[in-house]
Amino acid sequence: PEPPTACREKQYLINSQCCSLCQPGQKLVSDCTEFTETECLPCGESEFLDTWNRETHCHQHKYCDPNLGLRVQQKGTSETDTICTCEEGWHCTSEACESCVLHRSCSPGFGVKQIATGVSDTICEPCPVGFFSNVSSAFEKCHPWTSCETKDLVVQQAGTNKTDVVCGPQDRLRA
């Protein structure tokens, strides 16, 4: 028969014959022959391969370096890489999460729209009219101005995006 020019899924062409790829978690040791199947062996304890492959070396699991603020979110297996995340108060600088930076704080006049996670930074928003934030914080939202009326008081000093209103007693009309 004619030697193949293409092979089925999960196979590869070598020496004019189709050999089975090694399954995820295993590396290639020797190609198949006309008498034997592909020889594969498992990846080591700190290694992985996540696809059907013909790799002769497994990949090393990612190291979550605590000096960079990283910790293990999910331990790697022979078929998956380790997933790193950041320590509390820090977030990844990239999708690959190779290092961490401190969560950003929202300055006075801005409130937290979305609290940071291990993989995303704090999202701040300017405090709209009627709201304020007088602190730099990674958690505080914009607070509504105090309602003087509900306290039977009147506004003595208008609020801003950084300050609350100041309430005071109503002027009494003299009889």
Partner: antibody
Framework: EVQLVESGGGLVQPGGSLRLSCAAS????????MSWVRQAPGKGLEWVGI?????????YYASWAKGRFTISKDTSKTTLYLQMNSLRAEDTATYFC?????????WGQGTLVTVSS | DIVMTQSPSSLSASVGDRVTITCQAS??????LAWYQQKPGQAPKLLIY???TLASGVPSRFSGSGSGTDFTLTISSLQPEDFATYYC????????????????FGQGTKVVIK
């Protein structure tokens, strides 16, 4: 043709050194683990060691071979080597070059090494 | 190093006999065991790999079984061309960095005509 051809055997004095070569052809040398196996006259097979596939293939040896024998390869020349130092009379054997690790799919014809004064 | 203990060292049998050869590993090797046949003046020939997989072109009268430490090669009906020496090969594969890969052959079993 898929084959392994050993060379470099011969008579050597005790304490001497010898380098065996194994020329591989007909298959992708770079993606196959390669082993050395020896057989003393009239005796059984004895595993010497292995070099795994890939450019920086790891090597492993039988405990008796560690420190005296070294396996290496030149992928560009599709050639496997066995460097043997501090040879002893008990190293007299036919040395086979072989393809595979947990099972050997291809053997060379062997080269005879005789250690004698 | 791993040690493979093969028995018997020799056996005499007749054509048509059922022959069994055993091999024991000094530590668990999973299914990393192969069987070879060798005739005088020739290189060994692979018969069985992964403990029980028959190499292509090898007659179906040859079969292998076992895992861990105990393995068996069976020739269901001995043929004239089967008189030879048989070897098992065990392979200890390490997935840790503290131990090393090693392999060993059994001492061999010579099958002779009764």
């Amino acid at each position: 043709e898929v084959q392994l051809v050993e060379s470099g055997g011969g008579l050597v004095q005790p304490g001497g050194s010898l380098r065996l070569s194994c020329a591989a052809s007909g298959f992708d040398f770079s993606s196959n683990a390669m082993s050395w196996v020896r057989q003393a006259p009239g005796k059984g097979l004895e595993w010497v060691g292995i070099i795994y596939a890939g450019s920086s293939g790891s090597t492993y040896y039988a405990s008796w071979a560690k420190g005296r024998f070294t396996i290496s390869k030149d992928t560009s020349k599709t050639t496997l080597y066995l460097q043997m130092n501090s040879l002893r009379a008990e190293d007299t054997a036919t040395y086979f070059c072989a393809r595979g690790a947990t099972y050997i799919t291809l053997w060379g014809q062997g080269t005879l090494v005789t250690v004698s004064s | 190093d791993i040690v493979m203990t093969q028995s018997p060292s020799s056996l005499s049998a007749s054509v048509g006999d059922r022959v069994t050869i055993t091999c024991q590993a000094s530590q668990s090797i999973g299914s990393y065991l192969a069987w070879y046949q060798q005739k005088p003046g020739q290189a060994p020939k692979l018969l069985i790999y992964r403990a029980s997989t028959l190499a292509s072109g090898v007659p179906s009268r040859f079969s292998g079984s076992g895992s861990g430490t105990d393995f068996t090669l069976t020739i269901s009906s001995l043929q004239p061309e089967d008189f030879a020496t048989y070897y098992c090969q065990g392979y200890y594969y390490s997935t840790t960095t503290t131990t090393y890969d090693s392999s060993a052959f059994g001492q061999g079993t010579k099958v002779v005509i009764k």
